[in-house]
């Protein structure tokens, strides 16, 4: 089982949308795949895929999950808030027929405030 996650870095404006993609591949077929998205180590959602469908479409605050055969799991955050900033990791495990698990690399999401004044203040707070 292989999991590839992207992008490595994502910078978006508050109120817009962010799309994180996880590509899950296995040489043989699987009957049930457990997937998980975490943010800063905390679980956002942990649905499974079987018969081509996700058991859950919601993933964390303002998060929508979708599965596109053959291998793409997409987490869409819309609208993005400042609280969405963080490190996201996608994990997958084949539960049937045989247990095998893998996880992607981190996607770092940075959310810029919609208000340019807030942005200036933030920069001023962290010089260098």
């Amino acid at each position: 089982l292989s999991v590839q996650q992207g992008p490595n870095l994502l910078q978006v404006r508050q109120g817009s949308q962010a799309t994180l993609v996880c590509q899950v591949d296995q040489a043989t077929a699987w009957e049930r795949l457990r997937v998980k998205w975490t943010k800063d180590g905390a679980i956002l959602c942990q649905p499974y895929i079987t018969n081509g469908s996700l058991s859950l479409g919601v993933c964390g605050p303002q998060g929508r999950l979708s599965w596109q055969a053959p291998s793409h799991l997409t987490l869409q955050l819309d609208p993005v808030s400042l609280n969405h900033s963080g490190a996201y990791v996608c994990w997958a495990a084949v539960e049937i027929p045989e247990l095998e698990e893998a996880e992607g690399n981190i996607t770092r999401l940075f959310v810029d405030p919609d208000d340019p004044t807030q942005n200036r203040n933030r920069i001023a707070s962290f010089p260098g």
């Epitope: 292989s2 296995q26 043989t28 077929a29 895929i49 081509g52 095998e100 893998a102």
Partner: antibody, heavy 120, light 113 residues
């Protein structure tokens, strides 16, 4: 360019143990998402998948041969090793190693094969 | 185990004529999760290792002549050669990777008349 090369004895006696080595060049067997396989073909017959070892070290065997097989890898030498116990004349075959990726599932690269004859 | 049944076992063809090989599996090789058929076709030329021609039942490997085509889904698959050339002689094998043990068909020997 990835290359696989099988090596081992060309002749073994019945009841003996066969040890075959697959040396991989141009690619590291520690690369994630790859399976390293052994496949054999008796003269004039069909191909038979024998065993695989995954990047993680997980192994899988053909149930018809499982009790006689052990597949391992030596990452320091970039080699995959297959041992087969209690050899019999019906095990006379050309033995191939081949790779397979999670992204695909086909045998992409094959060695040239090594013919092993089992005879007293 | 999934049994792969190939027909015919022998296929004499005149150069320039079409050829067709059938492969049947004892259970479906289609996954509703990935929307893929886990079926590959190989050609083994005399004295050589097998080489991949078609994967996922119908996708031709880059560099394989377009006279080769694969079709089918579920349990019934076909490899077609639109116009056979002398260099196409050899043994053709289908192979499933739906599950382990990975299994091959008995092979079809294509020869030139």
């Amino acid at each position: 360019q990835i290359q696989l090369k099988e090596s081992g004895p060309t002749l073994v006696k019945p009841t003996q143990t066969l040890t075959l080595t697959c040396t991989v060049s141009g690619f590291s067997i520690t690369t994630g998402g790859y399976y390293w396989n052994w496949i054999r073909q008796p003269p004039g017959k069909k191909l038979e998948w024998m065993a695989l070892i995954y990047t993680s070290g997980r192994t899988s065997y053909n149930p018809s041969l499982k009790s006689r097989l052990t597949i391992t890898k030596d990452t320091s030498k970039n080699q995959v090793v297959l041992t087969m116990t209690n050899m019999d004349p019906v095990d006379t075959a050309t033995y191939y190693c081949a790779d397979m990726a999670d992204k695909g599932g086909w045998f992409a690269y094959w060695g040239q094969g090594t013919l092993v004859t089992v005879s007293s | 185990d999934i049994v792969m049944t190939q027909t015919p076992l022998s296929l004499p063809v005149t150069p320039g004529e079409p050829a067709s090989i059938s492969c049947r599996s004892s259970q479906s090789l289609f996954s509703s999760n990935t929307k893929r058929n886990y079926l590959n076709w190989y050609l083994q030329k005399p004295g050589q290792s097998p080489k991949l021609l078609i994967y996922h039942a119908s996708t031709r490997l880059s560099g394989v002549p377009d006279r080769f085509s694969g079709s089918g889904s579920g349990t019934d698959f076909t490899l077609k050669i639109s116009r056979v050339e002398a260099e196409d002689v050899g043994d053709y094998f289908c192979q499933q990777h739906y599950e382990t043990p990975l299994t091959f068909g008995d092979g079809t020997r294509l020869e030139i008349k």
